[in-house]
């Protein structure tokens, strides 16, 4: 039959070449000359020439030596036609099967392999996992199935079967207790990887196994111990730096140290942070301390890591005695803030109030007082008592120096220690109003038509507070009422001026007289240009320029 | 084993055609490759194809398809190269070579003398 | 296509000498290359094929060796017949490639 079984080749022939493999032979050879070809990838295609047949014979024949790793199977067909060139058969699928040698190493895909493990945990425990691949056949042959083993270890601390390797999947595993990072923090380990599955060739690459930090070690103060001064009232005062040291670690969650006052702080007057290269404890207070209250704190602090302990650790306890130091304390007014309230316009030498500061310190010293800041110049203060008297017009209205009725004064307190401390108090001074500004219209120069006159609206204003404002009453003196009519509106904050006669265009004074609510009068003079005009105007039209 | 290139030195104007023989004798004809090799003047050889007569079969080099045409004549035992739209790049010598059939992989052991052609105007 | 680098490009020798011709494959041709040797006016005649195998008829003092992509021919002791321009070609894949010709002078 024109069929050919499937052809095994093995690679790395050594010839002679051409070779001869198999005969394609078609019956039809029997009525007629047959000529024989193939084509197909390794024949005519690319690799082209790895196969060629005798044209007249059939014979396949190889014509170079075959690499399984780079071409595993060919696929070709083998062609039959007559002299003629009329094909006599159909194209035959030829299969030639390139059979494996062990002529590749196992190779790596790492030179150094790098993993790591906590210390002291259990043996079985998983490490890394290693892996070699070899592009020999490893399904119907063993040269290209890979076996690991460890060849040595470095160092061999505690002893030199810390890991085992798993042949076939290359995962390295801990097999012994004892690691410890403190003593070894890193094994070298050569592994190998033999084909034949562990009877063949044999190649070498590195695992590093870093051994990770477990928290196995205490932090511990030393000294344990400590004695420290600090001066009364001083906050954020640095008191005294814990030293601690530790094992594990440095500068992992292991080792840095997390600090606990556990007792002697009643008051709440202190802190503890980590410093974060020293490790240290820094004591700082968190309030001032009070020298006269309690002159000697002491002090226990309980170090601990960041990390939880793996294992039951004891922990390390400090002492730390403080010492108070006495300062000469400022005088504190009592209150810091104090609010009077005073009319305006009071008579000069007049008491506001007495203002007086306490001293914290033990010892009665003499206080003395004065005034820091008086903008307006308006008080004195009595150095021996505190006492605080007019010495000018407390004006509710002036605008430069009281805002929304208070007048603000800084005084300080002196006391006579060694050196003298000065402490500062805040006087509030709410002016009462009193009825010491008449209504002013506004505006005081209006432009009026002689005919029909539009009424001219005026707003009226006093700078003192109710009830010594609105309503306000309108009267005209000085004759003004023969021409002018004034009258306050319903609501009483604006008043309406008319002309009522007829005047000629020329500029007038109206004298106008308004009172408020507590009868306090205010005469204004309003100048009136009057215009030859009918109506709304606002300035004169024509050649007159007023007077 | 003779190879007898029958066709004197050819002389021949662009765009022109001209047909070479080359005839065998002393083996079997048809069981052999027959080669065609181009020497331009003081210049080396280049190979433009094959035939082998049994089938036909032909191989060219890529640079000469559609430039040389190979046939071959059973009966009279002579292989034939024809070659289209001369130009003077085309002036040179044509050699026809046996090479045996072993897988296409001998070398080529009988040359023709060789067919001179000039291509000119 | 495979490019065959021949070396050297001419070279003078006298009788009686031994001379090296190399050549160079730029890719693996096993043991495929051919050397001819072509005297002017005349057809190339093979002298050595699958690299070392000595055509019929050809002085044992003609010697091929190599294989893979570095071949070379040897002919001991020169003869003034010997003199003329020698080629090699890869006989494994089409198209055939020659190298460019080593001319061989008398001196």
């Known amino acids: 039959d024109w069929v050919v079984a499937p052809i095994s080749v093995p690679e790395n022939g050594k010839g002679p070449f051409p070779q001869r493999l198999n005969q394609l032979k078609s019956n039809k050879d029997r009525d007629t000359k047959i000529f024989y070809s193939i084509t197909g990838p390794g024949a005519d295609s690319p690799p082209e020439g790895v196969f060629a047949v005798e044209k007249e014979t059939g014979w396949l024949l190889l014509n170079k030596p075959l690499d399984r790793e780079e071409i595993a199977k060919y696929e070709l067909y083998g062609h039959a036609v007559s002299e003629n060139g009329a094909s006599v058969e159909e194209p035959m699928n030829i299969s030639i099967i390139v059979t494996d040698q062990n002529d590749n190493k196992p190779k790596f895909t790492q030179d150094t392999f790098r993993g790591s493990v906590l210390e002291g945990v259990l043996p079985g425990t998983s490490v890394m996992q290693v892996t070699a691949t070899d592009e020999d056949d490893a399904i119907y042959t063993y040269n290209g199935v890979v076996a690991y083993s460890i060849h040595s270890q470095e160092p061999k601390d505690p002893h030199d079967l810390m890991f085992t390797i798993h042949r076939s999947t290359g995962t390295i595993s801990v097999i012994s207790s004892g690691l410890d990072r403190e003593k070894v923090p890193e094994y070298t380990l050569t592994i190998q990887a033999t084909d034949m599955d562990g009877d063949g060739s044999t190649t070498t690459a590195v695992a590093v196994v870093e051994i990770l930090d477990a928290n196995d070690n205490a932090p511990m103060f030393d000294p344990q111990k400590y004695e420290a001064h600090v001066p009364e009232n001083a906050v954020g005062h640095e008191v005294q730096r814990l030293t601690v040291t530790d094992l594990d670690a440095p500068n992992s969650p292991a080792w840095r140290a997390t600090y606990l006052i556990m007792g002697g702080d009643d008051g709440d007057h202190f802190t503890i942070t980590t410093h974060p290269e020293s490790n240290q404890g820094i004591l700082t207070t968190r309030k001032g301390l009070d020298f006269e209250a309690k002159n000697q704190h002491t002090l226990y602090v309980e170090v601990t890591n960041e990390a939880p302990f793996v294992l039951k650790l004891p922990t390390s306890t400090a002492t730390i005695v403080v010492h108070v130091e006495d300062v000469n304390e400022a005088p504190v007014f009592v209150p810091p803030s104090k609010v009077v309230e005073v009319q305006e316009g009071i008579p000069t030498g007049e008491p506001v109030c007495v203002y007086t500061a306490e001293d914290p310190d033990k010892e009665n010293q003499k206080i003395s007082y004065r005034i820091l800041r008086d903008p307006a110049g308006w008080l004195a203060m009595d150095p021996d008592s505190g006492q605080v008297t007019a010495v000018g017009t407390l004006d509710r209205e002036d605008e430069q120096f009281v805002r929304n009725n208070i007048y603000e004064v800084m005084v300080l307190a002196m006391d006579n220690g060694s050196p003298p401390t000065t402490g500062t108090g805040t006087l509030l001074l709410t002016l009462i109003d009193v009825n010491d500004h008449g209504p002013v219209p506004e505006p005081r120069q209006i432009t009026i038509c002689n005919q029909s006159p539009v009424r001219q609206v005026l707003n009226i204003t006093d700078k003192d507070l109710s009830p010594h404002t609105s309503p306000f009453q309108a009267q005209l003196t000085d004759d003004s009422d023969i021409y002018w009519t004034a009258e306050v509106n319903e609501e009483g904050d604006t008043v309406v001026l008319s002309l009522k006669k007829f005047l000629k265009q020329d500029t007038y004074d109206v004298h106008l007289s308004l009172s408020d609510h507590g009868n306090k009068e205010q005469l204004t003079v309003i100048r009136a240009t009057v215009c030859d005009c009918h109506g709304h105007v606002e300035t004169c039209p024509g050649p007159w320029k007023g007077g | 084993v003779q190879l007898v290139e029958e066709s004197g030195p050819e002389l021949v104007k662009p765009g022109a055609s001209v047909k070479i023989s080359c005839k065998a004798s002393g083996y079997a004809f048809s069981s052999s490759w027959m080669n065609w090799v181009k020497q331009r003047p003081g210049k080396g050889l280049e190979w433009i194809g094959r035939?082998?007569?049994?089938?036909?079969?032909?191989k060219y080099n890529g640079k000469f398809k559609g430039k040389a045409t190979l046939t071959a004549d059973k009966s009279s035992s002579t292989a034939y190269m024809q070659l289209s739209s001369l130009t003077s790049e085309d002036s040179a010598v044509y050699f026809c070579a046996r090479q045996r059939d072993y897988g296409a992989l001998y070398a080529m052991d009988y040359w023709g003398q060789g067919t001179s052609v000039t291509v000119s105007s | 296509e495979l490019v065959m680098t021949q070396s050297p490009a001419s070279l003078s020798a006298s009788v009686g000498e031994t001379v090296t011709i190399t050549c160079r494959a730029s890719?693996?041709?096993?043991?495929?290359l051919a050397w001819y040797q072509q005297k002017q006016g005349k057809s190339p005649q093979l002298l050595v094929y699958n690299a070392k195998t000595l055509a019929e008829g050809v002085p044992s003092r003609f010697s091929g060796s190599g294989s893979g992509t570095q071949f070379s021919l040897k002919i001991n002791s020169l003869q003034p017949e010997d003199f003329g321009t020698y080629y090699c070609?890869?006989?494994?894949?089409?198209?055939?490639?020659f190298g460019a010709g080593t001319k061989l002078e008398i001196k």
């Open positions: 070609q890869n006989h494994y894949v089409t198209p055939f490639t």
């Open positions: 035939i082998y007569p049994g089938d036909g079969e032909t």
């Open positions: 890719d693996d041709i096993y043991s495929y």
